[in-house]
């Protein structure tokens, strides 16, 4: 018959044969043969493999390091990755949690709508029109633009979001 | 790698007064928001106030609004805390906190005890 070149879920191919992939958990040992099936090992302690795979190697378990804040939320098994997350009152910096902060900044054309808490991290709100924010910062509001008028001035330079707007005198000149 | 280091806690009794400082090395202070945390024993962090990196904007939580008064010193790379008024229930260890905040930067924090 004629060597597959195509196999089926949970298979592989090699040297024009399929042979199973290892479950979760597992590693590869040795392919199969002609005669023998796919040898495979299970992982081991503090290590993991989450998808059925030809792998030689499991992956490590993921360390949540106390020096960064961190703490394990969920122990990892023979199928699973370590789940970290950050102490009590501090705020993981992606959703991978690698490290922790008090809290986040609003960047500069953003405001804070709700300063941080013990449980739930900074919200921030774009600056709409009329308002901006030149820095980052935790708790400032977008701030609204200057008012030229009140002070007997013109806008020379429009305000964005990032920037107030710029007074200067009126021009007296008359034609 | 910055380094904030706090001073200025003890013991002092109900209504009195308390200045703490915050004395940053290691990086730049000039132009960082900063912020004072502190920790109740057994509690949680508690943000208590923050100041901009201008000086010009200042933040209080509610429970020292009026008692407490933040401001910075950026020729001497210290934020400072004024502490007025003090009661029992501002016992804590305080923290100062300089952008972005991350739990590297944390310094030991400074012992406040208001007792009779």
């Known amino acids: 018959p004629e060597p597959p070149t195509a196999c089926r879920e949970k298979q592989y191919l090699i040297n024009s044969q399929c042979c199973s992939l290892c479950q979760p958990g597992q590693k590869l040992v040795s392919d199969c043969t002609e005669f023998t099936e796919t040898e495979c090992l299970p992982c081991g302690e503090s290590e993991f493999l989450d998808t059925w795979n030809r792998e030689t190697h499991c992956h490590q378990h993921k360390y949540c390091d106390p020096n960064l804040g961190l703490r394990v939320q969920q122990k990892g098994t023979s199928e699973t990755d370590t789940i970290c997350t950050c102490e009590e009152g501090w705020h993981c910096t992606s959703e991978a949690c690698e490290s922790c902060v008090l809290h986040r900044s609003c960047s500069p054309g953003f405001g804070v709508k709700q300063i941080a808490t013990g449980v739930s991290d900074t919200i921030c709100e774009p600056c709409p029109v009329g308002f901006f924010s030149n820095v980052s910062s935790a708790f400032e509001k977008c701030h609204p633009w200057t008012s030229c008028e009140t002070k007997d001035l013109v806008v020379q330079q429009a305000g964005t979001n990032k920037t107030d707007v710029v007074c200067g005198p009126q021009d007296r000149l008359r034609a | 790698e910055v380094q904030l280091m706090e001073s200025g806690g003890g013991l002092v009794q109900p209504g009195g007064s308390l200045r703490l400082s915050c004395a940053a090395s290691g990086s730049t202070f000039a132009g960082y928001e900063m912020w004072w945390y502190r920790q109740a024993p057994g509690k949680g962090l508690e943000r208590v106030s923050?100041?901009?990196?201008?000086?010009?904007?200042?933040y209080y939580a509610d429970s020292v609004k009026g008692r407490f008064t933040i401001s910075r010193d950026d020729s001497k790379n210290t934020l400072y805390l004024q502490m007025n008024s003090l009661r029992a229930e501002d016992t804590a260890v305080y923290y100062c906190?300089?952008?972005?905040?991350?739990?590297?930067?944390w310094g030991q924090g400074t012992l406040v005890t208001v007792s009779s």
């Open positions: 906190a300089k952008d972005p905040y991350s739990f590297d930067y």
């Open positions: 923050a100041i901009s990196g201008s000086g010009r904007s200042t």
